[in-house]
Interface confidence: low
């Protein structure tokens, strides 16, 4: 089928286009080109007769068209009006006609665009800016670039006017950037030069440097002021409200105490019309001041509060030193120094952190010490202790009990007998006691600052007869060769003799046995399994005597090196192998077996029926005592001989 291809389809003004003919029929008489979508003699461009090779211009011929023998049409120096359809009319030798239509579009070559702005000096947080891409061109697409990137998504950015206008609402200093616009059509793309948006802002609150505010007499004072601002701020200095100079830096040499005061920096932006000020108070010391310690917490609570001690005053280029209890600071994770050593922080104070604390300022020739500061750490009350420790008294004596609990502030004490309040004193005195004074004696200690209370209860027995004693132990299951055990004979009674028996015999002489606390306590060092005996204590006075029930010591030991039985190591094939493992241990151990290193069963007896030479190898018994945390093992080599051969001793058994 006859077709027309336009090369190119989109043509720039001034360029050329070729209307290329495809599938031109054979045996042609001639052909003719027309402007438009149909054959119209008034719109004929050119005709061509093949026999004469004669081209004849038509009414629509502009002098820019060239026809080729293959019927293709070249149009040069294209103008906007050339846009549209073109029809080829082919006349064959048999005078049968055939037509085909093609088309192309003409676009102007775009000029380099430029950006116009409605506000060349917008003010931050106040103005909007509208950029417009010039010129306005038909059939062109408009694009925008910020710092050579496509537009970010922002509610403050708005495109309008077919994307030709970019509006920035409420500009900020961050909108200071390079903006470009680009125009595009099918035949060209052009980008504008950059436009830099100059946002006026500030001044922000100025900062005065350096930050330190304490100086020594004779030093130079050199203060610098800076405020973020566009255009750059103009600076003025005021001392105690009086104008000094319009410079960014203020320099006063060889200052004296009279230079102490408030120093104000004022920053002014003439374009935004805004002023901002910052004030710093400068203190000039006549000589290195004696340091002093300030605390953020004068009454810290133990295990609750942290305390920050600060060495005052803050002075530039000064070394700060600290002492606790007249010693340099100990290394402790609870002590922290600030970067400049000026602040010492005690984390989670304890009653031992009272001090005294001193700080010092290092001068050229000496160190100036602060006065010592003592922390008043509130603590307690701890569990009160009632003394004396006796619990048994004879009738007719005086009962004098004293109570004490560590506490700051000092605890307030109350006494209760059998739950009934008696008196609010630290000491309780009852003369000429009788059996009726037996009972529960409670001391209550109260800390009014923390609101905490602690109590201790003591049972007092008043009796002419000594009670039956009992034995208390500090370790009910001691481990052999490791632990010590202390037996104590209860109760503690005045004017009483304490005696001990082991397995019904008086105590043997041994360096591992020790009596203390008026023979009331019997200590066995490095207990052994042989110490697992019956222990009895006795008490006696001039009136009576009594013995405790026996207490048997349960010593944990082992496991010892196990024994595998029977001792045989050579077996005949077909026999049953029945190995038993035993280890002395308290409590009984856990047993397990391994054959050639491979775990087997967790039993005391290992049984294998009808063994063969495949059962040769090392048989290991492992014992473990979970109470002592100890393990042990033994290894035995087993040799199985084939039936009918004499089992000799195997080497390496």
């Amino acid at each position: 089928k006859l077709t027309i291809e336009s090369t190119p389809f989109n043509v720039a003004e001034g360029k050329e286009v070729l209307l290329l003919v495809h599938n031109l029929p054979q045996h042609l008489f001639g052909y003719s080109w027309y402007k438009g979508e149909r054959v119209d003699g008034n719109r004929q461009i050119i005709g061509y007769v093949i026999g004469t090779q004669q081209a004849t211009p038509g009414p629509a011929y502009s002098g820019r068209e060239i026809i080729y023998p293959n019927a293709s049409l070249l149009i040069q120096n294209i103008i906007q009006n050339d846009t549209g359809f073109y029809t080829l009319h082919v006349i064959k030798s048999d005078l049968v006609n055939e037509e085909a239509t093609g088309q192309f579009r003409v676009y102007p070559e775009l000029p380099k665009p430029s950006i116009s702005s409605n506000n060349s000096k917008p003010v931050e947080d106040k103005d909007a800016v509208a950029f417009t891409c010039e010129p306005e061109t038909q059939d062109a697409t408009y694009l925008w670039w910020v710092n050579n990137q496509s537009l970010p998504v922002s509610p403050r950015l708005q495109l309008s006017n077919g994307n030709r206008t970019l509006t920035l609402f409420n500009v900020t200093r961050n909108d200071t950037a390079s903006y470009k616009c680009e125009t595009q059509n099918p035949v060209s793309a052009r980008r504008s030069d950059s436009v830099i948006l100059n946002v006026l802002y500030g001044p922000d609150a100025p900062t005065i440097s350096p930050l330190n505010t304490s100086y020594r007499s004779g030093e130079n004072l050199n203060l610098s002021c800076h405020a973020a601002s566009n255009p750059p701020a103009q600076y003025s200095w005021f001392v105690n409200g009086t104008f000094q100079q319009s410079t960014q830096e203020l320099f006063i040499p060889n200052i004296t105490v009279n230079n102490s005061g408030s120093y104000t920096c004022q920053a002014h932006n003439s374009d935004t019309g805004l002023n901002r000020t910052t004030v710093t108070t400068i203190t000039v010391y006549a000589e290195p001041p004696k340091p002093f310690i300030t605390s953020n917490n004068s009454n810290p609570v133990e295990d609750e509060d942290a305390v920050a001690l600060t060495c005052e005053p803050e002075i530039q280029n000064t070394t700060y030193l600290w002492w606790v209890n007249n010693q340099s600071l100990p290394v402790s994770p609870r002590l922290q120094l600030s970067n400049d050593n000026r602040t010492l922080t005690l984390l989670s104070v304890t009653r031992n952190d009272v001090g005294p604390y001193e700080c010092g300022i290092q001068n050229e020739l000496s160190v100036d010490h602060s006065d010592p500061v003592i922390l008043n750490v509130l603590y307690g009350p701890d569990d009160p202790t009632i003394s004396p420790s006796y619990t048994y008294y004879r009738p007719g004596v005086n009962l004098s009990l004293s109570c004490h609990a560590a506490s700051n502030p000092p605890a307030q004490y109350s006494w209760l007998i059998d739950g009934n309040i008696q008196q609010h004193t630290q000491e309780l005195f009852i003369s000429n006691i009788t059996e009726k004074n037996s009972g529960l004696y409670t001391c209550q200690a109260n800390n009014s600052a923390s609101g905490h209370s602690r109590t201790t209860v003591k049972t007092i027995t008043v009796s002419a007869e000594l009670p039956k004693p009992s034995i208390s132990s500090n370790n009910s299951k001691p481990v052999e060769d490791k632990d010590a055990v202390a037996f104590t004979c209860e109760p503690e009674a005045q004017n009483t003799t304490y005696l001990w028996w082991v397995n019904g015999q008086s105590l043997p002489v041994s360096p591992r046995l020790q009596l203390s606390n008026g023979n009331r306590t019997l200590t066995l060092f490095n207990v052994t399994r042989n110490d697992a005996r019956a222990y009895v204590c006795g008490i006696q006075n001039s009136v009576s005597a009594n013995r405790s029930d026996p207490v048997t010591l349960d010593v944990l030991y082992g496991p010892d090196t196990p024994i595998i039985s029977p001792p045989d190591s050579s077996y005949l094939s077909g026999a049953n192998l029945n190995l038993s493992c035993h280890s002395a241990s308290n409590p009984s151990p856990q047993y397990s077996w391994r054959i050639n290193g491979i775990p087997q069963q967790h039993t005391q007896v290992l049984f294998i029926a009808k063994i063969t030479p495949n059962n040769n190898g090392t048989y290991a018994c492992f014992v473990s005592n979970l109470a002592t945390g100890r393990n042990n093992s033994i290894v035995k080599s087993i040799t199985v001989s084939a039936s009918g051969t004499s089992p000799g001793l195997s080497a390496g058994a």
Epitope: V479, Q590, H602, A620, S624, R630, N631, S633
Partner: nanobody, 119 residues
């Protein structure tokens, strides 16, 4: 991966000393017991020394008591066997073996280091 690497073995004259090291990786030895076990041709395997790092408990075979000392440095995750007054009968391959306190027998073994006592 749990690994035990013994080192320190070698040839020494009778009466001499050696210090064996057992470097552990893949676990913390402070929660374990460590044993030095020796194997010699023609002899039964023998547990010569044993230490439980969580109790400090130590134990020695009668044949090495007073001559060998077992210790452990939990910060270096390493166990040691200091062997003094060495005898010909101490010649063996020495293995370090680790068992946790709840374990049955030795859970992990090293590859062994050879000690030869000979004049």
């Amino acid at each position: 991966e749990v690994q035990l690497v013994e080192s320190g073995g070698g040839l020494v004259q009778p009466g001499g000393s050696l210090r064996l090291s057992c470097a552990a990786s893949g676990f913390n030895i402070k929660d374990t017991c460590i044993g030095w076990v020796r194997r010699a041709p023609g002899k039964e395997e023998e547990l010569v020394a044993y230490i439980c790092n969580y109790t400090g408990y130590t134990r020695y075979a009668d044949s090495v008591k007073g001559r060998f000392t077992i210790s452990a440095d939990t910060s270096k995750n390493t166990a040691y066997l200091q062997m003094n007054s060495l005898r010909a009968e101490d010649t063996a391959v020495y293995y370090c073996a680790i068992t946790s306190y709840h374990g049955q027998g030795y859970n992990y073994w090293g590859q062994g280091t050879t000690v030869t006592v000979s004049s």
